[in-house]
Interface confidence: medium
């Protein structure tokens, strides 16, 4: 049966499904906020514009009866179930925003006619790369590879020396959903990273990564997890670790390194943190006052969400263009608008650029310091620090294979 | 005080080489970096390459690879700059100055050497 | 390389005056909140010295007529009141990436 699209004649929807699984244990009523912040600044972008139309939101909610474990894993059904209410309403806005949830989106994009633009904060799996109307506005798992790519193959910077090759990948199944799916794409031996690596291992228990820590027989002398640096701790503890160890954890979605007075606890020299750049307007935002700053992120992607719908909006207005067009549902890639806090990229296939930084632990001020940075849109390490205080010796990144000589 | 003192006045022939000194004194010379910078007659600034004394690392501008070659000397607070194959192009006078670190990681440059002239003619 | 482009070449001021000297970048010098960008002056025959950090930071001993602002590609040095000392060229520098100067702007009294 056919929907219908509340998309013309001066007014503009956008439908935002409301997911008790989603990929950030997140009170629906912070992405509320943030998805009405984001209304409020549209409006007054379209009427600066001479734009004079009506935008707003219509929030979808799950009944939960079926699948309400809160929980990623489970969130198949929850996004074709929403799809089915729509389907019974008849109608629905321009574009859908949401589902977070890899599982969801896939599921949702196999099983429907998408011939509208779809935008997630999240789906961060390899399985929804390459989606002709999805745009993603929290880093996706291939971001994430082309990155530690990039870096391992680096060898011409004053503090790394060595191209690397090999890897162990720390995965236990109970990570986040955004590290799940970074893991995911590590693991899988179809992926880029598997492809330019000569041995990489997979460690799923406890014991397993404690071991490698002092084990001289390793193969590896890098090991990648994701995480924050407490789960690092819970796993680690105060356990020794060889000298030419280096920890990589992800941790793209946590401003906390950046806060005033954060001192890194001992067990973080041997670690380098791969976080983003955080946004500075976003620490006093009405709609993230009561974020912690790991939820910062996914309310402004929902909030950076409207933002693009909004600048879409626009942009078709202004050329006098339908809405309701596949060329619209299309449009959502190869660009860059005005998101909250400056500039959002989105790559050629609807995925967000940003910059990531790596992070090491200064041994004389037991201070986060910036190693370097990595810009999604163009693939380029620039170094920052590059003289820096390093736990390795002579303050180079070790090799990850350690030179044993003759045995 | 901090200064930077900077080697006298080269003149040189096409093609040879001249290595410039840059002594450090009033601070703790490894706990900066040493950058060298180039000023031609009539043109602005451009960066050469740092050097961290404590570890010896360098990191060049890719336009001056193969052209300059830094080094320093802990024992004696010195940084050395080394030009080979030198061209009328070289003829400019070569700054030293102290680079120093931030939070951030990103270094920039707070206390100058008094310029080195280096005129290449034959 | 990050292109950092200075405006006007040059400037001819009355003394008491303010001046302004722009800096563009042809990307983003931020990074985690802090703008890469640095100001020097250079008088004939001396070396640069460094005036402005960061974008805003005044350099110990630098008179308070001095005074930076911008933020990630559009930089500003402000000089008011212009002083007969005030006579150099001015260069800005990113540290945001391999680091580059601005081409200068060299500042004369009417």
């Known amino acids: 049966s056919q929907v219908s699209q509340n998309c013309h004649n001066g007014s503009y929807e956008i439908s935002v499904l409301m997911m008790d699984n989603s990929a950030f244990a997140e009170p629906l009523e912070n992405v509320e906020d943030a998805v009405n912040e984001g209304l409020e600044i549209v409006r007054g972008r379209l009427q600066n514009a001479g734009l004079n139309v009506t935008v707003n939101a219509s929030f979808m909610y799950s009944d939960g009866l079926i699948h309400n474990s809160g929980d990623c894993r489970s969130s198949t059904c929850e996004g074709l179930d929403l799809l089915r209410k729509i389907s019974n309403a008849k109608r629905m806005g321009c574009v859908l925003m949401g589902p977070s949830c890899t599982y969801s989106t896939f599921q949702m994009y196999l099983d429907t006619e998408l011939s509208y633009p779809m935008i997630s904060a999240g789906s961060f799996g390899l399985s929804c790369d390459y989606k002709e109307t999805l745009t993603r506005l929290m880093s996706p798992a291939r971001k994430l590879t082309y990155f530690l790519v990039n870096f391992w193959k680096t060898n011409d910077l004053p503090f790394k020396t060595y191209s690397w090759s090999t890897s162990y990948v720390y995965k236990n199944g109970t990570e986040s959903e955004d590290c799940f799916w970074y893991l995911n794409a590590l693991e899988a031996s179809v992926s880029y990273f598997s492809h330019e690596l000569s041995f990489k291992l997979v460690l799923r228990q406890d014991k397993e990564f404690q071991d490698i820590l002092m084990d001289h027989n390793r193969k590896s002398n890098v090991i990648v997890m994701c995480g924050d640096p407490e789960f690092l701790y819970k796993l680690k503890g105060d356990r020794a670790v060889a000298e030419d160890i280096v920890i990589i954890l992800v941790d793209l979605f946590n401003d906390q390194y950046f806060e005033d007075n954060v001192t890194a606890p001992d067990y973080m020299k041997n670690v380098l943190v791969l976080t983003r750049s955080p946004g500075n307007s976003l620490l006093n935002s009405s709609f993230s006052r009561n974020l912690s700053p790991t939820k910062r992120d996914f309310a402004l992607a929902y909030l950076n969400g409207i933002l693009l719908f909004g600048h879409m909006l626009k942009t078709f207005l202004e050329n006098g263009e339908n809405i309701t067009t596949p060329k619209f549902a299309h449009a959502f890639r190869n660009l860059t608008f005005e998101g909250y806090d400056g500039p959002v990229t989105l790559d050629d296939w609807g995925d967000v650029d940003s910059t990531m930084v790596l992070l090491y632990t200064s041994v004389d001020t037991k201070k986060y310091k910036v190693l370097l940075t990595y810009d999604t849109h163009v693939n380029q390490t620039n170094p920052v620090d590059m003289s820096p205080t390093f736990t390795w010796k002579n303050s180079k990144l070790p090799n990850d294979i350690t030179d044993r000589g003759p045995q | 005080q901090v200064q930077l003192q900077q080697s006298g006045a080269e003149l040189a022939r096409p093609g040879a080489s001249v290595k410039l000194s840059c002594k450090a004194s009033g601070y703790t010379f490894t706990s900066y970096g040493i950058t060298w910078v180039k000023r031609r007659t009539g043109q602005g600034l451009g960066w050469i390459g740092e050097?961290?004394?404590?570890?010896?690392?360098?990191y060049y501008n890719e336009k001056f690879k193969g052209k300059a070659t830094l080094t320093a000397d802990k024992s004696s607070s010195t940084a050395y700059m080394e030009l080979r194959s030198l061209t009328s192009e070289d003829s400019a006078v070569y700054f030293c100055a102290r680079a120093i670190t931030t939070v951030v990681g990103d270094w920039y440059f707070d206390v100058w050497g008094t310029g080195t002239t280096v005129t290449v003619s034959s | 390389d990050i292109v950092l482009t200075q405006s006007p070449a040059s400037l001819a001021m009355s003394l008491g005056k303010r001046a302004t000297i722009s800096c563009r970048a042809s990307e983003s010098v931020s990074l985690i909140g802090t703008n890469l960008i640095h100001w020097y002056q250079q008088k004939p025959g001396q070396p640069p010295k460094l005036l402005i950090h960061h974008a805003s930071n005044l350099e110990a001993g630098v008179p308070a007529r001095f005074s930076g602002s911008g933020s990630r590609t559009d930089f500003t040095l402000t000089i008011d009141p212009v002083e007969e000392d005030d006579v150099a060229i001015y260069y800005c520098?990113?540290?945001?990436?391999?680091?580059?100067f601005g081409g200068g702007t060299k500042l004369e009294i009417k």
């Open positions: 050097i961290y004394p404590r570890s010896g690392n360098t």
């Open positions: 520098l990113q540290s945001r990436k391999i680091r580059t």
